[in-house]
């Protein structure tokens, strides 16, 4: 007798997984853009805001061509994990002014968490190395004032927007190599 029938398809092929990861990243990018605009409407930004604890932007668009799949996914996962922790911190310690960004900030956190799980699943399916995330940074100190919390929110949402924009481009390029 021949081999027993194999299992039916239980989950998406990694290429389909990459497609849905791109869709999820695009959706998160739109959410972030909308939330950043909402923040600017309520609390106009006076210039650029930076937060030393945020990751530096992974890559310029021009350097995308040289990317390798493991490097992109590893770096993206590390950066998004950092942004997730910053969003959690913002919701916890951002002060009453930022309560006006709920429930959108909560939705953003949940979607960011989902994207991270999707990236990890993709890395597992491809059997790409999943190096340990950087050792946890010391806990973020609460903002010194209400305005400090708002400035931090501008920096976090702005940085996340740039990172997700880079991520969409990078993932689309990687799709052609898979």
């Amino acid at each position: 007798p021949g081999p027993p029938p194999g299992p039916p398809r239980v989950s998406p092929d990694p290429r389909a997984e990459l497609d849905s990861t791109v869709l999820l990243t695009r959706s998160l990018l739109a959410d972030t853009r909308q939330l950043a605009a909402q923040l600017r409407d309520k609390f106009p930004a006076d210039g650029d805001h930076n937060l030393d604890s945020l990751p530096t932007l992974a890559m310029s668009a021009g350097a995308l061509g040289a990317l390798q799949l493991p490097g992109v996914l590893t770096r993206l996962r590390a950066d998004l994990l950092s942004y997730l922790r910053h969003v959690q911190w913002l919701r916890r310690a951002g002060g009453s002014s930022l309560k006006t960004l709920e429930p959108e900030l909560g939705t953003l956190q949940a979607r960011l968490d989902r994207l991270l799980r999707r990236l990890q699943l993709l890395m597992s399916r491809l059997a790409l190395p999943q190096p340990p995330p950087d050792p946890p940074a010391p806990p973020l100190a609460p903002p010194s004032s209400a305005w400090g919390g708002i400035r931090a929110a501008h920096a976090i949402l702005g940085g996340l927007h740039l990172t997700l924009d880079w991520a969409v481009r990078g993932l689309l390029l990687l799709k052609t190599r898979l």
Partner: antibody, heavy 114, light 111 residues
Amino acid sequence: EVQLLESGGGLVQPGGSLRLSCAASGFTFSSYGMHWVRQAPGKGLEWVAVISYDGSYKYYADSVKGRFTISRDNSKNTLYLQMNSLRAEDTAVYYCAAGVPDYWGQGTLVTVSS
Amino acid sequence: QSVLTQPPSASGTPGQRVTISCSGSSSNIGSDLDVHWYQQLPGTAPKLLIYSNEERPSGVPDRFSGSKSGTSASLAISGLRSEDEADYYCAAWDDSLYGPVFGGGTKLTVL
């Protein structure tokens, strides 16, 4: 439907060698990382080795490092496990598995005994 | 000895709810890494039951659910049936080993 069919198992003496093969069909083999996982009689599952979708990354359990080699041929949709310096404790059913692993073969029995 | 710790056995009567735990460390479950669960019926190959902590593959009944918190995870089976009698294994990627690790397995008996 997805099929993973292992072959190459059998009885071998301690210190001997065997090469296991796993023929894959029903899915895009070249898009999946592939694993070998074994199960000694009456025992639990033990991961043996993994190879990335394109063959560029290979990792091994400490218990087989330096003795076993995992490889793949994406043009033939086939996964391999070259097992050298076999020991009695390598006796197990060897499963080939794809992805997380999402899919598993039915396994092939390797018996190491004199 | 397995890297992930599971109780060797669990039991329940038909219709009952049973939970199987899986405990890891900071290099696997606690390292923001996902947990997967497998069911192995007697004499057969393992089958993916839950992936990414709580996702069910198509074809797996919603009586099976998974969750994760900190360095541990659990599999819950509600409305227990006689056909659920099997060995259940948890698995997760381990940062320090650069590969997946399995729990020792839990033999579920339906009384």
